[in-house]
Interface confidence: low
Amino acid sequence: DAHKSEVAHRFKDLGEENFKALVLIAFAQYLQQCPFEDHVKLVNEVTEFAKTCVADESAENCDKSLHTLFGDKLCTVATLRETYGEMADCCAKQEPERNECFLQHKDDNPNLPRLVRPEVDVMCTAFHDNEETFLKKYLYEIARRHPYFYAPELLFFAKRYKAAFTECCQAADKAACLLPKLDELRDEGKASSAKQRLKCASLQKFGERAFKAWAVARLSQRFPKAEFAEVSKLVTDLTKVHTECCHGDLLECADDRADLAKYICENQDSISSKLKECCEKPLLEKSHCIAEVENDEMPADLPSLAADFVESKDVCKNYAEAKDVFLGMFLYEYARRHPDYSVVLLLRLAKTYETTLEKCCAAADPHECYAKVFDEFKPLVEEPQNLIKQNCELFEQLGEYKFQNALLVRYTKKVPQVSTPTLVEVSRNLGKVGSKCCKHPEAKRMPCAEDYLSVVLNQLCVLHEKTPVSDRVTKCCTESLVNRRPCFSALEVDETYVPKEFNAETFTFHADICTLSEKERQIKKQTALVELVKHKPKATKEQLKAVMDDFAAFVEKCCKADDKETCFAEEGKKLVAASQAALGL
């Protein structure tokens, strides 16, 4: 449905408030270093222009594509070259190459200061003084730090952020009301960003087919009563939405997501019995709710899969006629029967099935060749089951912090070339799988754990891609999206690694550690642990545990001392010497 003016079309569909918010997100995700005020100015200019196009779609430049309009606007930034260096070269290109160029320069780990939360009274005053600017600033700060954040979902977060301040800034105990809400939004926001980053990586690195396969499996688990044709339609629409958002087309993405939510709610009878509550909510809450909705009950008396996919004499004929449709049907049928499997496992099974048909349908006796294909699935299913069982036992034995430490040691030994901050961040997140998933019953553990691990390992992959230092990481990240976790699991200690030289400065601590939060103090200790392993990759668990216990005791002792700084200096030297002796450094 072609429109004379795309910008007018989106402005009318989305409304001024959402239009402005989405343009701000888009600009902040592209130009991550630009000051807030510059972005607000650009957004206001675009909005005024959009209004002229709404008034007269034939007005000058109103027929230009959104990429052209937004790109032209971004390229007016005076400090583009000194702030962004080679990104300024994008402006010499024509669309669509210019937008592709901007996309390639998105930085997953921008050099921006950590967001420090001001005092509650200061935040409430700022909120009351200028609510609009306060909320725009939230969108800007999140978008520039998370350049692939799912834009329509960020609008939902901003709505909750506003609600938190509206409620809590008039509460008797503002801090008790507000801080837990902000913590929850921060943690949910990080998780949402990482999940979306995996979707974009899937589309951009492995293509639309890979994303569609993921979507077929996930939606079939969620909507097992829906027909294959219905699931296929939802997959096509969902793929369009995410392709747009990952490609920076945020207005189209938000508009199409709203249309998809509307379609799902209008057709919920043929999709899922679990959608009723979601569909009664306002738009942003509705879309979020649908995305998180629990799996519907499986239809009773589903026939055995073997009949259609192994025993039928038409298997090769059906496969040859429409390979992707037949494989899609296999994936749909398998996934709707197995809400207890992770999506990545389902995709591995589908890949095994595809490989078997490719080989067998060219054989003299195809049926004889593929008759035992389901037997090949058993080891693929058992591998994640066993891994999750072992790791949940370890988590229950150690608790989250020590479980994270075990993973820190494990991953540092596997890929010691990776930067220490990345190893700490990724291993801490890997370790959170314990508290997130091990509490679930058996039937929910694997989808929770393995699909979460896929999200976390993708963080490692995108951070490593910026500065590749380990071909083992590159190999696991690029060879197969669904086999990333097994690839990393299979890595042993890197025997080729030359240990880092010992540097006492790395293990020198000061009194400021005493004022840190428990989480920040843990990160300091975990950073030291990674550095220890990099210096002594062959250190045993027992040796490392002894050193870390000494280190914890040292921090506790010096934080209780009257002259903390002297204690850290003197006791620190002793600790370094003792650690060197214990590890044979």
Epitope: E86, Q104, Q204, K205, E465, P468, V469, S470, D471, T474, K475, T478, E479, T496
Partner: nanobody, 117 residues
Framework: QVQLVESGGGLVQPGGSLRLSCAAS????????MSWVRQAPAKGPERVSA????????IYADSVKGRFTISRDNAKNTLYLQMNSLKPEDTAVYYC??????????PGQGTQVTVSS
């Protein structure tokens, strides 16, 4: 799967030139720094040269500075090494790798360069 296929090696006289190519597939070539590494008989691997993902930065081993030039064509997913003023000590198997690694990234066999009169 990651594939790196080197070509362009051969027998050349001292002072001669060769141009090596490395065709990449199975990963987003334009997003990665790349290296040329060589291994002479009975010696460990040596990184000859490396180039950043957008070709804005290059590194050369002291032994090849001023004689070798690394380049890339991201549109063609290809890495190049132009080798001039070749010397007998440049004799080795040359292979390309992802990042700054000195271990092969893919199943490529490398390409033999022999400098001899």
């Amino acid at each position: 799967q990651v594939q790196l296929v080197e070509s362009g090696g051969g027998l050349v006289q001292p002072g001669g030139s060769l141009r090596l190519s490395c065709a990449a597939s199975g990963f987003t070539f334009g997003q990665f720094g790349m290296s040329w590494v060589r291994q002479a008989p009975a010696k460990g691997p040596e990184r000859v040269s490396a180039i950043s993902s957008d070709a804005s930065g290059t590194i050369y081993a002291d032994s090849v500075k001023g004689r070798f030039t690394i380049s890339r064509d991201n549109a063609k997913n290809t890495l190049y090494l132009q080798m001039n003023s070749l010397k007998p000590e440049d004799t080795a198997v040359y292979y390309c790798t992802i990042g700054s690694s000195t271990t092969p990234s893919g199943p490529g066999q490398g390409t033999q360069v022999t400098v001899s009169s």
